[in-house]
C-alpha cells in the first residue's frame, strides 16, 4: 500500500474549503477538501439533504 504524505494546507489556501478541512496532499501536489457532514463538491461548496422516505404500507 502506497503511503500518502499529507499536511495542513498553507495560509495561501485560506477559504479554499467552504465547509470542510483543507488537506495538502504533498506527493500529488494538490489541496483536498475533507467535507463536513452534509456538504459535497471539490471545495465542499454544495449542501445536500438526505431525504428519508416514510415506510410504505406493505412494510407496516
Amino acid at each position: 500500500v502506497a503511503q500518502v504524505s499529507i499536511t495542513k494546507c498553507s495560509s495561501d489556501m485560506n477559504g479554499y474549503c467552504l465547509h470542510g478541512q483543507c488537506i495538502y496532499l504533498v506527493d500529488m501536489s494538490q489541496n483536498y477538501c475533507r467535507c463536513e457532514v452534509g456538504y459535497t463538491g471539490v471545495r465542499c461548496e454544495h449542501f445536500f439533504l438526505t431525504v428519508h422516505q416514510p415506510l410504505s404500507k406493505e412494510y407496516v
Partner: antibody
C-alpha cells in the same frame, strides 16, 4: 487535458488599459484559485494577485492595488486581468496560473508592450 | 508581506559541479516553498514543491531542503541542459518569488 489558454499579444499606449483573458479547459475554474504573475523583459517573476472564481474574492499585491482588477466569468470558464494607467515599465509577459486542485499550472503567457 | 531573498543572483559552474542556491524568507514559511526552472522564451517549469518534493519527470539530481526561514536548492551534478534561471516561490501566505539565480556553464 487541462489547459489555460491566454489571449494574444497587445500593444498599448501609455495611460491606456489592457485586459488579458485566460480561458480554462478540462477543468472548472470554480474548483481553483487563478493567480496572475508577470515578467518584464530580462527581469524576474512578480506575483500580482489572485481571484477565487467561486465567490469573486480577490487579493492584490499593494504595489498594484487600485490599478489592477482581476475578474472571472464562470459561465465561460475564463479569468481576466485588467491593468490600467499603463506605463513603459508595465511591458511584460503576463501569466495566469491555476492553483488549488493542482499545484501551479501555468498558461502560455501574454506579451503586453507599452509604447508611445 | 513575506519577502524572499535569493542568492546568488548569478553563478558560473562547470559540468558535473554541485550547485547550491539559497532563499531566505522574512518570516517562517512552514516549508511552503517551491522551486522553478525557466529557460529563455519559456514559461517557468515547476521542479520542487513543499521544500523537497520532486515533480514527476524531474531528474533526481535536483533536490531541496530547509525549514523555518532558510531553504536550499541543489543540483548535485550540473548538466548542460540545466542552464537556466531558477526561482524560489513562497506560498505560505499569498505568494512571493525570489529574485532569481542565473546559472551558466564555465
Amino acid at each position: 487535458q487541462d489547459q489555460l489558454v491566454q489571449s494574444g499579444a497587445e500593444v498599448k499606449k501609455p495611460g491606456a488599459s489592457v485586459k488579458v483573458s485566460c480561458k480554462a479547459s478540462g477543468f472548472n475554474i470554480k474548483a481553483t484559485y487563478i493567480q496572475w504573475v508577470r515578467q518584464a523583459p530580462g527581469q524576474g517573476l512578480e506575483w500580482m494577485g489572485r481571484i477565487d472564481p467561486l465567490n469573486g474574492n480577490t487579493k492584490y499585491v499593494p504595489k498594484f492595488q487600485g490599478r489592477v482588477t482581476i475578474t472571472a466569468d464562470t459561465s465561460t470558464n475564463t479569468a481576466y486581468m485588467e491593468l490600467s494607467s499603463l506605463r513603459s515599465e508595465d511591458t511584460a509577459v503576463y501569466y495566469c496560473v491555476r492553483s488549488g486542485t493542482l499545484f501551479d499550472f501555468w498558461g502560455q503567457g501574454t506579451l503586453v508592450t507599452v509604447s508611445s | 508581506d513575506i519577502q524572499m531573498t535569493q542568492s546568488p543572483s548569478s553563478l558560473s559552474a562547470s559540468v558535473g559541479d554541485r550547485v547550491t542556491i539559497t532563499c531566505k524568507a522574512s518570516q517562517d514559511i512552514h516549508k511552503y516553498i517551491a522551486w522553478y526552472q525557466q529557460k529563455p522564451g519559456q514559461a517557468p517549469r515547476l521542479l520542487i514543491q513543499y521544500t523537497s518534493t520532486l515533480q514527476p519527470g524531474v531528474p533526481s539530481r535536483f533536490s531541496g531542503s530547509g525549514s523555518g526561514t532558510d531553504y536550499t536548492f541543489t543540483i548535485s551534478s550540473l548538466q548542460p541542459e540545466d542552464i537556466a534561471t531558477y526561482y524560489c516561490l513562497q506560498y505560505d501566505n499569498l505568494r512571493t518569488f525570489g529574485g532569481g539565480t542565473k546559472v551558466e556553464i564555465k
